[in-house]
Amino acid sequence: SEITLGKYLFERLKQVNVNTVFGLPGDFNLSLLDKIYEVEGMRWAGNANELNAAYAADGYARIKGMSCIITTFGVGELSALNGIAGSYAEHVGVLHVVGVPSISAQAKQLLLHHTLGNGDFTVFHRMSANISETTAMITDIATAPAEIDRCIRTTYVTQRPVYLGLPANLVDLNVPAKLLQTPIDMSLKPNDAESEKEVIDTILALVKDAKNPVILADACCSRHDVKAETKKLIDLTQFPAFVTPMGKGSIDEQHPRYGGVYVGTLSKPEVKEAVESADLILSVGALLSDFNTGSFSYSYKTKNIVEFHSDHMKIRNATFPGVQMKFVLQKLLTTIADAAKGYKPVAVPARTPANAAVPASTPLKQEWMWNQLGNFLQEGDVVIAETGTSAFGINQTTFPNNTYGISQVLWGSIGFTTGATLGAAFAAEEIDPKKRVILFIGDGSLQLTVQEISTMIRWGLKPYLFVLNNDGYTIEKLIHGPKAQYNEIQGWDHLSLLPTFGAKDYETHRVATTGEWDKLTQDKSFNDNSKIRMIEIMLPVFDAPQNLVEQAKLTAATNAKQ
């Protein structure tokens, strides 16, 4: 009839489909970690370092809806903060549980290890508060279960990190087991009916009058789980639909009404024209960051812009605080077809044509590769693109339907995707072991976080690791310092990494020509995720997708502006 508080936490996480927990052990969380093994269906990933653990938690949450990382007081939690900040910026729900010193040690202000030596036990908690939706420091066993529930709910509903401090002495104390019988209420609170009605009526009126409307799916379409509603919106209205770089994967790119990726001035001309000449823009989950908008180069001709957000709506210049897009979209779906019945569908921009045939000996270049990649991808794949050439190149790839796209366009922490790949691979395995996880990362980025490949091997995870070897930090060379020594890196023997980290069943490949790419990606056995694979892609030093070259110029100009 009673269970420990530690076990309570893990039972609650299991109830919301968090089955893998990331992080590292430290003496203030060891008793807590004991309890994970008491809950069937839960596993402790055990990462190589806390930064990578935070990245892994982020990748897992992008697939499963939320995640959990456990670190230890001070040294552990601070190492995770860059990753947690990225999750905050990009709307990813990560519960950060920190094992902290016992309440008595804190009360006595003991000069414990992992402290700053000044008796202040709240300093790290305060640091995290600025990049958390809410925080809790458990001090009372009686209220602890409710606080845990509140933190889990907030993580999921807001899709932001939440900080939960658990003193070492409390995790072994008992709480009533029957509390687990009442599920945490994870549903959104209904919108204010009057405001919601005004929003819906206004949108329907705009739709009725529109001759040239478009739908634009952005980051929070995926993060706040309105992908299904957005897909239905496209079906019902037949409006042309576009994505932003952060929206890749949020709508079906094989849909006949899909028009491409809109990135302001960096868009293909026909996409730019289609979006910017629209007389109504339904923007779902907009996140208007520089790299997501071609350095803020949106140039809409219309003022009829409807922005759907997780916690507010914006129509033209009017903001409706607290009106959540999920409910608005669900209600719109019941009436919008009627409002849109006068719309005469216009042609959407043509797909990027397939690559022209070239001799098999042609050296591989990015423009060709990203276009060709679509032939290798399958429905349900998780495609992860590192900050740099990969995150820009992937915009040129047309995804199969139901593809998950992961990149960190706003926060842009180099090396993020190695850890995110680990997290996504855990999540994918839990959903369907055949689901493929495919990473594209530069040789420079990989050097920041390479240790997490070891964790993939430890758990028998089987991602595809495509390493783009173009000899250095290409994105930074393009922005500034093309020949600067600080943009150079030590070359690695990439194909020795898997055995170095202890892999037994693995494959390595080096690809330098178009013929080698096609031969490998068309090989039937290569298409099954039967083992972990590292594929080194040899590319010319300054080779980059054209959209990155253009973005680099814009960024350099912004940085130089007085």
Partner: nanobody
Framework: QVQLVESGGGLVQPGGSLRLSCAAS????????LGWYRQAPGKQRELVAT???????YYVDSAKGRFTVSRDNAKNTVYLQMNSLNSEDTAVYYC???????WGQGTQVTVSS
């Protein structure tokens, strides 16, 4: 591994009723939107109804007033009650876990006299 198993399909006369079930395993689906879809011979798979985390429901026009979608989170099961069936409802009915893109194997519904 997440799995969805549909049941309750069969042969029914026009005007009759059926209740389809979709049981989930490997997941607690109380925090997931579930959709019922159908695919008639020679046609594309189409949405029929969805039920969200909070229990909000959505129906396509052809299902409104005849079909009711509901969920029992304790049993990890979602239901589709279908009344006033007609020959155009003949199809394989699938359920789908929307966030994860996971489909069941389908259950055949045939409406015929």
């Amino acid at each position: 591994q997440v799995q969805l198993v549909e049941s309750g399909g069969g042969l029914v006369q026009p005007g009759g009723s059926l209740r389809l079930s979709c049981a989930a395993s490997g997941i607690s689906f109380s925090i997931n939107t579930l959709g019922w879809y159908r695919q008639a011979p020679g046609k594309q798979r189409e949405l029929v109804a969805t039920v969200t985390t909070g229990g909000s429901t959505y129906y396509v026009d052809s299902a409104k007033g005849r079909f009711t979608v509901s969920r029992d989170n304790a049993k990890n099961t979602v239901y589709l009650q279908m009344n006033s069936l007609n020959s155009e409802d003949t199809a394989v009915y699938y359920c789908k876990l929307e966030r994860y893109g996971v489909w069941g194997q389908g259950t055949q519904v045939t409406v015929s006299s």
